[in-house]
């Protein structure tokens, strides 16, 4: 084993100095002799010294203890003293205690041995070990007065070689963390939760993120335990974008032929019945009725026109019901109704016409007489000197209950070279021009069409008579959806429950899933904002899709072209999910199709408008929208255009 | 489209008579009356009866019956108003319009001055 | 017969001025009012028939209001093409009548 020079020297010098023990007595002696006893020289004293150092050293002392105690005749005992002790310079020991192994006195000097750790002429300068390579340690190296000791980082334990450092696991103990998973870390440890989560040290506990006070959602934030969701205003046209934070306008993504006609009247605009057109004819001369229009419809049932006085007089009413021509009149109090002629409900355009004869009214369909009925009296009446007529299209100027017969006078139809009286009539054309809304789709097929912009609602009951046997449940509700979306998003059928503002019940077009946050096309069966079953559906093809919804007592089944949906709860949460359900049925519930009321756009996954075509059953009935409590009047009920034919 | 085309302007003496006639186009004729309007220079618009173009019945008001005729003929769709005995106080435009309770369709107007 | 009161007889108004004409009728003809506009040389121009109603062509500056007996024509903001003589006339019974008229001058 090598030491450094300086300690070999400090080992070496004990040694050597036992050699010169004998010869240190015998001067000891030699100087009692000379210069304590008498008075010694300069030379007397390098006499006993045998060199120049020492005697330099100690000669001028020795004056000091003559001057200090007399000379040595005097034979104070004082004076022997102080001189036995010139010669020795470790007494007084010079070196430090603390860091002196041994003090060795020279020739005229001393050296003072230092303790490891120690260093100096005097042995009071603390070495620092840690200066030369850390003193050795791994981590940390502690230097001290003398000596210094190794220590570890927080985390890690030093080892039995007192140098090297060792990583505690912290996740040994199993309180480490609480209930959080905890992973041992060099030097470390984490206590880790769940995305959503964050670890409270306080409580050792995973604790709830709520990403809603970061303000990640641009409209509405919902936070959930370890997630959050946000919502767009769907009744505004809006949707979540790709990164499921901010808002997009829902846009349509299948194009429909929605082009209008400028020379067309679309009789179904109102859908409080009353009429779209109210013509006033007054005449000084006496004028009978002619009227000839071209028609278009799908719809069985409504109110083509109406021509005469007030309710009480003489009038005549021209309908449709179960898609023939029908025609109300009443003459002087007394009132008929006559129906003939053939289904004219096909969608296709046919000439119908209206005259009054001297004692006839002739109705013609493509210029063949369909009905023929005598009268007795005019329908233009004279009053103050002139004659009066009142005209109106697609509605009665009085309620349906004073018909003759009630009938539904909504009617879902197009007219167009229309002819009143055999005058021009440039005040309709120049008022359906500028009035898109007064205008017919150029082309129509069966259905019924959402534009995007409104819903229709009924009142429906849900709950099963006594009277209906042959089964258990006390409830059901069975909903078959023919589509043909031309927008990715929004409600096709849905329950409100108005008490309560809430939606017990919907099924929506969807283009993203909630829980995983991923984009994908689907339809939703949800209750209140459950989620209770989902469906992937290929929404922007153009092309017909059946949804077919069941729930009863204890079942929910999502089916899309005859395929079942994936259930998103558990059987659980369904049986809880469909007692709430059940709990609104018992109430008054309203029945919506293709949009929902102004709810919070929390109450159910989609609130946005449905567009496109669409028919709905419920409980095996057909819903025909002219029998609704209410209609969004750009909703047409028995027409849809057809999809845009793709570019060449 | 509806045109009623009214004869020339007429400057009749006192004591004559005057024939002015309105030829009516674009619809049917008999399906609407005929009115007569007058407007004397400077004054305002008085209705002055209208004839049934079925019937060819006039009605007057009473401030022209007696020297004033209202004629037609279906045959040339033309409707004419006569005016005997003619006054310095005939001395107006006179407008044909089509009957529709009200009038849209109106002739460009005959002026007939009276002046000795 | 039903008489009918047009009042002012003239008024003189600048460009983008509103023009109130009223026309006071001696019955109550419900809403059987009709407004004409005239100018020299030419034949009334119907603006407004039964009912308020404006006729097609017609700007929609021009609009009328009232029923039973009183009734008014206005301009909301007149334009150089307004200046003439305006006319109500009631077909609510025989014999029709016209009111005086109103001449509408540049100030």
């Known amino acids: 084993a090598l030491l450094p020079a300086r300690e070999a020297t400090q080992f070496l010098r004990p040694r050597q100095r036992r050699a010169f023990q004998v010869f240190e007595e015998a001067k000891q002696g030699h100087l009692e002799r000379e210069c304590v006893e008498e008075l010694c020289s300069r030379e007397e004293a390098r006499e006993v010294f045998e060199n120049d150092p020492e005697t330099d050293y100690f000669y001028p002392r020795y004056l000091d203890c003559i001057n200090k105690y007399g000379s040595p005749y005097t034979k104070n005992s004082g004076f022997a003293t102080c001189v036995q002790n010139l010669p020795d310079q470790c007494t007084p020991n010079p070196c430090d205690r603390k860091g002196t192994q041994a003090c060795q006195d020279l020739m005229g000097n001393f050296f003072c041995l230092c303790k490891a750790g120690w260093g100096g002429r005097l042995c009071d300068k603390d070495v620092n070990e840690c200066s030369q390579e850390n003193g050795g340690c791994l981590q940390i190296c502690h230097n001290k007065p003398g000596s210094f000791h190794c220590s570890c980082h927080s985390g890690f334990e030093l080892s039995s070689d007192g140098r090297t450092c060792q990583d505690i696991d912290e996740c040994a103990d199993s309180e480490a963390c609480g209930e959080a998973r905890c992973k041992n870390l060099p030097g470390s440890y984490s206590c880790l939760c769940d995305e959503g989560f964050a670890y409270s040290s306080q409580e050792k506990a995973c604790r709830d993120v709520d990403e809603c006070l970061q303000g990640r959602c641009e409209q509405v934030c919902v936070n959930s335990p370890g997630s959050y969701t946000c919502h767009c205003d769907g009744r505004g046209g809006l949707k979540l974008s790709q990164d499921m934070d901010t808002c997009e306008d829902i846009l349509p993504c299948v194009p429909f032929s929605v082009a209008k006609s400028v020379k067309s009247l679309y009789l179904g605009r109102m859908f409080s019945g009353t009429p779209v057109i109210r013509l006033r004819f007054k005449r000084l001369q006496p004028t009978r009725l002619v009227a000839e229009f071209d028609f278009r419809t799908f719809d069985p049932e409504g109110i083509l026109l109406f021509a005469g006085g007030h309710q009480d007089s003489t009038w005549i009413v021209l309908a449709l019901r179960a898609g023939r021509l029908e025609l109300q009149l009443r003459y002087n109090g007394v009132g008929r109704v006559t129906s003939s002629g053939p289904v004219i409900n096909h969608g296709m355009w046919q000439t119908i016409s209206v005259e009054e004869l001297a004692r006839n009214l002739v109705i013609k369909v493509n210029r063949d007489a369909v009905m023929k009925i005598a009268v007795a009296g005019d329908l233009f009446q004279p009053e103050r000197g002139l004659y009066h007529l009142n005209l109106t299209v697609g509605g009665i100027p009085f309620h349906e209950k004073d018909l003759v017969q009630p009938i539904n006078p909504r009617l879902d139809g197009c007219m167009r070279s229309w002819n009143w009286l055999n005058g021009e009539d440039t005040t309709i054309q120049e008022t359906v021009k500028v009035n898109t809304r007064m205008q017919c789709f150029s082309v129509t097929e069966r259905g019924s069409f959402y534009p995007g912009s409104g819903f229709a609602f009924y009142s429906l009951d849900y709950m099963r008579t006594p009277l209906d046997v042959g089964t258990e449940s006390t409830w059901e509700v069975e909903v078959v959806a023919h589509i043909r979306p031309a927008a990715d998003t929004g409600v096709l059928f849905a329950l409100w429950a108005p008490d309560l503002r809430a939606v017990p019940l919907s099924v929506a077009l969807v283009d993203y899933h909630s829980t995983k946050k991923l984009k994908k096309q689907l339809v939703v069966l949800a209750v209140e904002h459950t989620a209770l079953a989902l469906m992937e559906i290929k929404v922007c093809d153009g092309q017909e899709h059946v949804v077919t919804v069941s729930l009863r007592d204890g079942e929910a089944t999502l089916e899309v072209d005859g395929t079942r949906g994936q259930s998103e709860v558990s059987a659980a949460q369904l049986q809880e999910r469909l007692a709430v359900l059940e709990r609104h049925l018992r109430s008054p519930v309203l029945t919506f199709a293709g949009g929902l009321p102004d709810v919070p756009v929390t109450s159910a996954p989609v609130t946005a408008f449905y567009r496109g075509c669409m028919t709905l059953e419920v409980n095996r009935r057909l819903l025909d929208l002219d029998e609704a409590a209410y209609k969004h009047s750009d909703i047409t009920a028995h027409s849809c255009p057809p999809v845009e034919p793709a570019a060449a | 489209q509806v045109h009623l085309v009214q004869s020339g302007p007429e400057l009749k003496k006192p004591g004559a008579s005057v024939k002015i006639s309105c030829k009516a186009s674009?619809?049917?004729?008999?399906?609407?009356?005929m009115n007569w309007v007058k407007q004397a220079p400077g004054q305002g618009l008085k209705w002055m009866g209208w004839?049934?173009?079925?019937?060819?019945?006039?009605t007057y008001t009473e401030e022209f019956k007696g020297r004033f005729v209202f004629s037609l003929d279906t045959s040339v769709t033309t409707s004419y108003l006569q005016i005997s005995t003619l006054k310095a106080e005939d001395t107006a435009t006179y407008f044909c319009?089509?009957?529709?309770?009200?009038?849209?369709?109106w002739g460009q107007g005959t002026l007939v001055t009276v002046s000795s | 017969e039903t008489t009918l009161t047009q009042s002012p007889s003239s008024l003189s108004v600048s460009t983008g001025d509103r023009v109130t004409i009223t026309c006071i009728t001696s019955?109550?003809?419900?809403?059987?009012m009709n407004w004409y506009q005239q100018k020299p040389g030419k034949p009334p121009k119907l603006l407004i028939s039964e009912g308020n109603t404006l006729r097609p062509g017609v700007p929609s500056r021009f609009s009328s209001s009232g029923s039973g007996t009183d009734f008014t024509l206005t301009i909301s903001s007149t334009q150089p093409e307004d200046f003439a003589d305006y006319y109500c006339?009631?077909?609510?019974?025989?014999?029709?009548?016209f009111g005086q008229g109103t001449k509408v001058e540049i100030k």
């Open positions: 674009g619809y049917t004729f008999t399906n609407y009356g």
């Open positions: 019955t109550d003809i419900d809403d059987d």
């Open positions: 006339l009631q077909t609510d019974s025989v014999p029709l009548t």
């Open positions: 004839i049934n173009t079925n019937t060819g019945e006039p």
């Open positions: 319009a089509r009957d529709e309770g009200w009038f849209v369709y």
